[in-house]
């Protein structure tokens, strides 16, 4: 039987009446164009909705936008367009919402041609009031808030000027010209690249990387011959052109660009690219594109310095620079990532790692699922997950995989069961153990969202026809109830719930169409009365993450420690609540060789856990140099995996080797670095 249709399902009593009393409709008095929605702050209930309507005329575009505000999670909206003087807001810039609970909002307006600069509307009280400010430049990008101080903004102008404001957009100062890319670092530091000979495109590979730590009073050139740069965790990466040819290499700094080391990664040619897939303060996942137009590359994982890299996954699907990759961090369980590989026969298969890229495997076939037509053996196959690539290929996949840090272990995704991703209509699958095992949750494609830290899952069928039914589950997707939220079906455009999955409100967005007009409409449903009581101790049970064999003393050990969690029982219908904090208990594991990666100059032969010294490295593709600093180049061949907390057990000690004489290249020697002031 289909999920939720057998006698196993515990029904939620009187749910229709409870939900009907908590369903709020709002019809927007606009013509249907585009709509964008932003949450302002956390747990504030404030939502801003911007509707825009474009009419392309012969010479220009006529546009109208309206701004609405809700302060009750979308149950009621108020038209506040007058607060922005009925100005047309540029949708491509969206609404720039300040970090954390700053309550700051910046809207960028469309201004008529010939004006000296752009115009913004600023609010610092959660969009209750706005101040109009005319800019001394035309913005090219959305305003970027400093993560440390929401009063500090930066923006690039259409003339490639780098502009900074220290008083939340009231006054602006151009701190540098000829800027290609600018990013906030930590401690209000700004990193940016500049060109010398005319344009960013013309100077690609000859850019300079600059840093200012005082909002433009002084500058330091921290890199030359730069192709691009990126920030990930505590690492600053620069892609640098080689002296002798058109290849480039990654260099990494962990001190904001004062010193650099060459990453032990292959160099790439003009048509190739590097991409930081994920980064934290411990390590980095780096994708290195394969030569030629293959659509795939290799994932490498770094050591704690971002210098030494281990090959993690071959034939990793990544179409082009800025193109599509299915790489997904499963945020509901530590160490878990999912992605796709392009196999030799050009089929796409899903792979999962539970140990931060150490090993990759196929996803286990869901119980009670049949292998589809892609499977050679009808009894042996895997689950394959649809993510960004499938969406880009216009397959019938309305949503990417979903996981939330506070809904421990839960992963929801579209997928197919076979030897590879299928172009057939997918179903929705759920895992409650971070991707180790899966169950079919819903037949056919759906939109889905997690509420109340996993206490409720909500879904809406993906259909070209108007809809009026929402499905919900209080037991992690085992059983489903359906609720008709309106008599008059709407053309559905999206589900919206407050980021963080702590809310119990869901908004269903769509439009109604009549003979002459179509209007935006939203239905906000509050599930608070479905989960009538607060959860108590008896509603939770203890779960060991990553458990595979209880008879193994180290069962559950991942990166040197195991974690037990208190998890809501599937049968408990109660509120985790907005203040819910995941209760977990770590315990340290004994070290094994699996807890170490091979340091520079060493490698692991296939099916061996020991690190063996590489043959002579001179001229080797993976050569690197740390200014020949001796202390960096002494190694016993092993290095603890970043984030690994193991203690005791195996301690790989061997003769310490000095690899300084094997160092054969350099970058940005200190004399090349110079300081400049405004």
């Amino acid at each position: 039987s289909a999920p939720g249709e057998d006698e196993e399902c515990g029904r939620v009593r009187d749910f229709v009446a409870k939900l009907a009393n908590n369903t709020h409709q709002h019809v927007f008095d606009d013509l249907r164009g585009s709509v964008s929605l932003s949450w302002v702050g956390d747990s504030t209930g404030v939502i801003l909705v911007l509707t825009t309507f474009h009419v392309p005329l012969v010479i220009m575009t006529f546009g109208q936008s309206k701004l609405y505000r809700s302060e009750d999670y979308g149950k009621n909206f108020k038209d506040i367009t007058d607060l922005i003087n009925n100005t047309f807001i540029r949708t491509e810039f969206g609404m720039a919402i300040g970090p954390e609970n700053s309550g700051k909002v910046v809207l960028t307006a469309e201004v008529s041609g010939g004006s000296r600069g752009g115009r913004i509307f600023r609010s610092s009280d959660f969009a209750k009031n706005f101040v109009q400010t005319d800019l001394p430049f035309h913005p090219l990008t959305q305003m970027m808030y400093s993560p440390q101080n929401s009063d500090y903004l930066l923006a690039l102008s259409t003339e490639n000027g780098l502009w900074v404001s220290k008083n939340f957009g009231g006054k602006w100062e151009e701190i540098h010209k000829a800027v290609c890319l600018a990013k906030w670092g930590s401690d209000n530091t700004i990193f940016f690249t500049t060109y010398a000979n005319g344009s960013c495109k013309a100077d690609l590979g000859a850019l300079e990387l600059w840093r200012t730590s005082d909002l433009g009073k002084s500058f330091k050139t921290i890199g030359v011959k730069i192709y691009s740069f990126g920030l990930g965790g505590r690492f600053l990466f620069a892609s640098v052109m080689a002296d002798k040819d058109t290849t480039r290499r990654i260099h990494v700094s962990t001190d904001q660009g004062d010193t650099w080391s060459m990453a032990q990664l292959p160099s790439v040619g003009q048509e190739q690219f590097y991409s930081i897939l994920a980064a934290n303060d411990d390590m980095v996942f780096m994708h290195v594109d394969e030569p030629g137009d293959t659509g795939f590359g290799t994932i490498f994982t770094s050591d704690d310095r971002g210098i030494v890299y281990s090959k993690s996954l071959d034939r990793h699907l990544y179409t082009t620079t800025g193109g599509e990759t299915d790489f997904t961090n499963v945020t509901s369980l530590r160490g878990v990532y999912i992605t796709s590989v392009l196999s030799e026969d050009n089929s796409i298969q899903t792979m999962i790692t539970f140990d931060q890229g150490g090993r990759w495997t196929h996803l286990r076939k869901p119980e009670n699922s049949e292998c589809d037509a892609t499977a050679k053996n009808k009894n042996e196959c895997s689950l394959h997950i649809h993510a960004s690539y499938s969406i880009s290929q216009k397959l019938n996949v309305p949503m990417a995989p979903l996981s939330e840090p506070n809904a421990v272990g839960i992963v929801i995704a579209h997928g197919s069961v076979g030897d590879a991703i299928s172009v057939m209509v997918p179903d929705v699958y759920i895992s409650d153990d971070g991707g180790a095992s899966w169950t079919k949750m819903l037949e056919g494609p759906h939109y889905y969202t997690i509420l109340d830290s996993g206490g409720i899952i909500v879904a809406i069928e993906h259909s070209s026809r108007p809809i009026n039914v929402i499905k919900f589950s209080t037991d992690e997707g085992q059983c489903w109830q359906t609720y008709t939220f309106t008599r008059d079906p709407i053309y559905f455009t999206g589900l919206a719930s407050e980021p963080g999955a702590r809310s119990m409100n869901i908004s269903i967005w769509g439009f109604t169409e009549s003979f002459l007009t179509s209007q935006w409409v939203s239905y906000t449903i509050d599930f608070k009365d479905i989960l009538e009581r607060n959860c108590e101790e008896k509603d939770y049970t203890i779960w060991l993450a990553h458990s595979t064999d209880p008879e193994d003393y180290e069962d559950g050990c991942i990166l040197g420690y195991k974690e037990q969690f208190l998890r809501l029982r599937k049968s408990s219908v109660c509120q985790n609540g907005r203040d819910y904090v995941v209760t977990k208990q770590p315990s340290i594991c004994l070290c094994s060789l699996e807890d170490f990666l091979c340091d520079f100059g060493y490698y692991r032969p296939e099916n061996d856990s020991k690190c063996v010294e590489q043959p002579e490295l001179k001229g080797h593709d993976l050569e690197f140099c740390l200014y020949g600093r001796e202390e960096h180049l002494t190694t016993n061949g092993y290095r603890k995996i970043p984030g690994d907390k193991c203690q005791g057990g195996v301690n790989p000690v061997r003769e310490v080797k000095d690899l300084k004489k094997k160092c054969t290249s350099n970058f940005l020697s200190p004399e090349k670095q110079n300081s400049k002031s405004n």
């Epitope: 095992s437 085992q478 049970t541 779960w543 990553h546 008879e551 193994d552 037990q564």
Partner: antibody
């Protein structure tokens, strides 16, 4: 083969406490929950509570909350159950049992290994 | 807490009989139910876990079924060694046992 060996029979006065031990051998004690179940003469089985040796995470049946304390010592692979404020109706055979485990959930798969039982008699 | 109601409380049967014991939960417990056999003066022995999975070493004449709130233990052909008391136990909440069913010789 996993075995659970419990301490010997006890005779206690009302109002006093009793502490029963349960020593595991031949398996990975730390990775399984240990439950305590009692059976009064001629009666059925009654779950009192359980503990997971890793981290010492204990939980108790509502009926015994505040009166029972379950602990575990990983180094000796031993679990303990202490029941205080004893009354005559606490006279029973007390069993420790290992919770079988097939996944990360500790308490869902039944109790697959049992101790031999410890008779506790409460009498003035 | 979840209540478990077992029936019948006593059952008289002969060797070779097919015996069925039922257990009802006061609320849905999915498939989280175990069955035990206990003989006088001995500790209980696990027969079935997760409603229908047979514990290793248990004869295949024992089988379990059901989900949600209604569960059944079946002994397809009663053997002399099977005369004992049987308990169901739910695990989807603080653990609770049924009252027991004594299977005696007719």
């Amino acid at each position: 083969q996993v075995q659970l060996v419990q301490s010997g029979a006890e005779v206690k006065k009302p109002g006093s406490s009793v502490k029963v031990s349960c020593k595991a051998s031949g398996g990975t004690f730390r990775n399984y929950a240990i439950s305590w179940v009692r059976q009064a003469p001629g009666q059925g089985l009654e779950w009192m509570g359980g503990i997971i040796p890793i981290g010492g995470w204990a939980n108790y049946a509502q009926k015994f909350q505040g009166r029972v304390t379950i602990t575990a010592d990983e180094s000796t692979s031993t679990a303990y159950m202490e029941l205080s404020s004893l009354r005559s109706e606490d006279t029973a055979v007390y069993y420790c049992a290992r919770q079988g485990r097939k996944t990360g959930y500790y308490y869902y798969y039944g109790m697959d290994v049992w101790g031999q039982g410890t008779t506790v008699t409460v009498s003035s | 807490d979840i209540q478990m109601t077992q029936s019948p409380s006593t059952l008289s049967a002969s060797v070779g009989d097919r015996v069925t014991i039922t257990c009802r939960a006061s609320q849905s417990i999915s498939s989280w139910l175990a069955w035990y056999q206990q003989k006088p003066g001995k500790a209980p022995k696990l027969l079935i876990y997760k409603a229908s999975s047979l514990e290793s070493g248990v004869p295949s004449r024992f089988s379990g079924s059901g989900s949600g709130t209604e569960f059944t233990l079946t002994i397809s052909s009663l053997q002399p060694d099977d005369f004992a008391t049987y308990y169901c136990q739910q695990a989807d909440g603080h653990i609770t046992f049924g009252g027991g069913t004594k299977v005696e010789i007719k």
